[in-house]
Interface confidence: low
């Protein structure tokens, strides 16, 4: 901060702001009676030059005219783009320990006078909004710079609306707060931008438009749409618009789509009819304007509109499977199951299944609803039973599908050959078969099942199948395949009253178990040792287990022990060996084998025989 | 975030006047949806009117056909307050009245169905005595 000028004063030729190149006299003179005190001769006046409140310069060379004692006139040049401060002061150099004294200072803006600003361009958004114009200022002035924008129209309409900028903001954008109504549709307008600073001023080119040129509609807003009797396909959509709209775009799609359905509609006056939507299907849907048909702009697209179209009728045929199981000797368990519809086949909520197990000759039918997609009756095993189900919803009932309860497995001639279960991948397998070799009747189809081989898988889950047709011998199963989990797959071959089917094991990744089996007991019967054990817990198996191993050795013994290898069965839990010697104590342990590898041993568990050796 | 705290309400006999305010703080701006809703008890919220106002200034209102011509919206966007003018009041009039702001979903009723916007007040009471 300068005193006020008390001492003197500083005077800048040819003025304060000066164009970038140009050179600069400053003059700093004292005022009368002021000085050093005594002796004015030795009044020495020195130009500090400051950049951002830092001292850059002391422009003593500088100086190009010189009244000792009363004034001197420094010239400076190169100053750079900005506002640079100059400070006199006062030097009295017969005291050398006093500092020099200020006496006035004079700040220098040097800049370029403004460019014509271009590209200017205007809009109004919507018939309501206001004229709002934005244009390019340019280079930088490094000025204070004022920007003019003038709108003229018919009638010697005329408007203006002022902004500057600065170092601290830019001006290259003006509301005018003129709204252009409908009726001056063909009327042209001019618009033109002026810029002025202490450099200099120009002006743009006039900017000619018309209403329909900057007009930018509204969105369509209060978008709505009425289903012609609750149809799910056809519905009229409906919106709001300003009242000089002549086009719309429509837009909509499924919620989980990736691409729109496109639709223009060319006076729609705020009404179009949609015939080819999906029942029971959350869609979206959104409405662009424009007043002209072949100029103008779109607006923006209006707000989303999500709804669900109504339910029709399901299409669907489901997919059913069941299993059997004998009770006792006239009575059979009956599980039937079903896949749920697609929802382009559903085409709505499914409420209820409607099943119906029917005895062909004796004309027997039980019938129920069910919400699940399985049902299981209990039913005599004499007789030809068929089984159908369909699917209800709002609108109504998809055709029922009917199934021939056959048995599944019993036809040994029917049963596929060669079934292979390969690991593709971390989630799939693929099965692959040969036909039956002597089938006597031609194969329908065949059913691909598989379910995981774990405890209660039977009860507590569902199967999962695939229908495969005769002419295919391979299958890739996938749905609820998980690694590192052993499933049971059966190939079903069925015929219109029979049923053949081969069964094996499968996984899609495996590892070495993590454990081996825990041997529970050792009993000797008749000469032979008896060992008894626990499966390994179905978690550990990691896959499918090939067979088990039995080693012994006898306790002390530094040779290999000595194996035997088992198929591995889930049923089994126990297997006889009988090449131990009597009155000699054994170790004896188990593994388990994958395809992946052997686990470590179980437990050790030590016997010694006491019948004869074989 | 944005705050809306509604204001104004009140008793009046029919016919009289109430003006409603509806200040917005936090993130605030002018190009949004606002609008006032009521309800009476046992009824569901109903939209009353509203107001658009785009990124250039220009806007749009809207009324529900029972309050057309009695009563009037508006917002002063430097108080970034919404106002609801009301003359010639009814009985039927007698409502909670709600202040909302920011249409970001559109349903089948357009600006009248209340789930469609993100921001609500807690409401202001009217009561209309004949």
């Known amino acids: 901060n300068i005193d006020v000028c008390k001492l003197g004063t500083v005077t800048v030729q040819p003025a304060p702001v000066i164009p970038l190149g140009s050179a600069a006299n400053i003059s700093c003179s004292l005022n009368p009676k002021q000085g050093c005190s005594h002796y004015p001769s030795s009044n020495e006046l020195i130009l500090l030059k400051f950049v951002n409140d830092v001292l850059v310069e002391n422009l003593h060379g500088k100086k190009v005219h010189d009244h000792t004692g009363h004034s001197s006139t420094f010239q400076v040049t190169n100053l750079s783009l900005g506002m640079t401060l100059f400070v006199c002061k006062l030097n009295c150099s017969n005291s050398q320990k006093k500092p020099p004294v200020p006496v006035c200072g004079v700040e220098i803006s040097v800049g370029v006078a403004p460019e014509p600003p271009q590209n200017i361009s205007c809009v109004q958004e919507g018939e309501n909004g206001t004229v709002a114009c934005s244009w390019n200022s340019g280079k930088v002035t490094y000025l204070k710079t004022n920007y003019t924008l003038q709108l003229s129209g018919p009638n010697n309409l005329t408007c203006q609306k002022q902004c500057f900028s600065d170092n601290r903001q830019n001006c290259n954008r003006l509301d005018l707060g003129i709204n252009l109504s409908p009726d001056l549709a063909e009327s042209r307008f001019i618009v033109r931008v002026t810029a002025i600073n202490d450099l200099g001023n120009s002006s743009s080119l006039p900017h000619t438009f018309t209403f329909l040129d900057i007009v930018i509609p509204l969105p369509p807003w209060d978008i709505r749409i009425n289903f012609l009797n609750a149809s799910g396909s056809r519905g009229t959509l409906q919106w709001e618009d300003e009242g000089q709209v002549v086009l719309n775009q429509l837009r909509y799609q499924p919620l989980n789509s990736t691409s729109w359905n496109m639709v223009n509609a060319t006076n729609a006056k705020g009404k179009y009819d949609l015939r080819d939507l999906r029942p029971f299907t959350e869609y979206e849907f959104q409405i662009s304007s424009k007043l002209h048909l072949s100029g103008g702009s779109w607006s923006n697209w209006s707000e989303s509109l999500r709804t669900r179209t109504p339910e029709e009728e399901p299409v669907g045929i489901l997919d059913i499977w069941y299993m059997k199981q004998d009770i006792d000797y006239d009575r059979q368990q009956i599980s039937l199951f079903w896949k749920s519809l697609n929802p382009s086949e559903a085409r709505g909520k499914i409420l209820h299944y409607q099943v119906t197990l029917q005895e062909v000759t004796k004309k027997t039918t039980l019938q129920n609803t069910t919400r699940h997609t399985s049902w299981t009756r209990v039913i005599p095993r004499t007789g030809a039973w068929t089984a159908s189900v369909s699917a209800a919803n709002s609108k109504g009932a998809s055709a029922p599908t009917h199934i021939n309860i056959v048995d599944l497995c019993g036809t040994g001639l029917l049963a596929p050959h060669q079934v292979s279960a390969k690991s593709e991948n971390m989630d799939n397998i693929l099965v692959t078969w040969q036909p039956p070799k002597k089938a006597d009747s031609a194969v329908r189809e065949y059913i691909v099942e598989w379910r995981a081989l774990q405890p209660g898988s039977i009860t507590k889950f569902p199967p999962h199948w695939l229908r495969i047709p005769p002419d295919n011998m391979s299958a890739l199963i996938s749905e609820n395949i998980k690694p590192y989990i052993c499933y049971e797959i059966r190939v079903h071959a069925l015929s219109e009253s029979q049923g053949g089917c081969s069964s094996i094991r499968g996984d899609s990744k495996h590892k070495a178990p993590v454990s081996g089996p825990h041997i529970t007991a050792i009993t000797e019967k008749k000469e032979r040792l008896f060992i008894s054990w626990t499966h390994i817990p179905f978690p550990e198996q990691r896959g499918c287990i090939l067979h088990y191993r039995i080693y012994w050795k006898e306790r002390d013994s530094t040779a290999q022990p000595e194996l035997c290898e088992i198929q591995y069965r889930r049923s089994q839990n126990s297997h006889p060996i009988s090449s131990l010697q009597p009155r000699v104590t054994y170790v004896l342990w188990m593994t388990a084998v994958t395809a992946a590898g052997e686990s470590p041993q179980g437990n050790e568990r030590e016997f010694c025989p006491q019948g004869k050796a074989n | 975030q944005v705050q809306l705290q509604e204001s104004g309400g009140g008793s009046v006999q029919a016919g009289g006047s109430l003006r409603l305010s509806c200040a917005a703080s936090?993130?605030?701006?002018?190009?949004?949806?606002m609008g006032w809703f009521r309800q009476a008890p046992g009824k569901e919220r109903e939209g009353v009117a509203a107001?658009?106002?785009?990124?250039?200034?220009?806007?749009?209102?809207y009324y529900a056909d029972s309050v057309r011509d009695r009563f009037t919206i508006s917002q002063d966007n430097a108080k970034n307050t919404l106002y609801l003018q009301m003359n010639s009041l009814t009985p039927e009039d007698t409502a909670m009245y709600y202040c909302?702001?920011?249409?970001?979903?559109?349903?089948?009723?357009?600006?009248?169905?209340?789930?469609?916007?993100?921001?609500w007040g807690q409401g202001t009471q009217v009561t209309v005595s004949s």
């Open positions: 936090g993130a605030t701006n002018s190009n949004r949806h």
């Open positions: 107001i658009y106002t785009g990124y250039t200034g220009g806007g749009n209102t």
């Open positions: 909302a702001a920011d249409l970001t979903r559109w349903y089948s009723g357009g600006w009248r169905d209340p789930r469609g916007y993100k921001y």
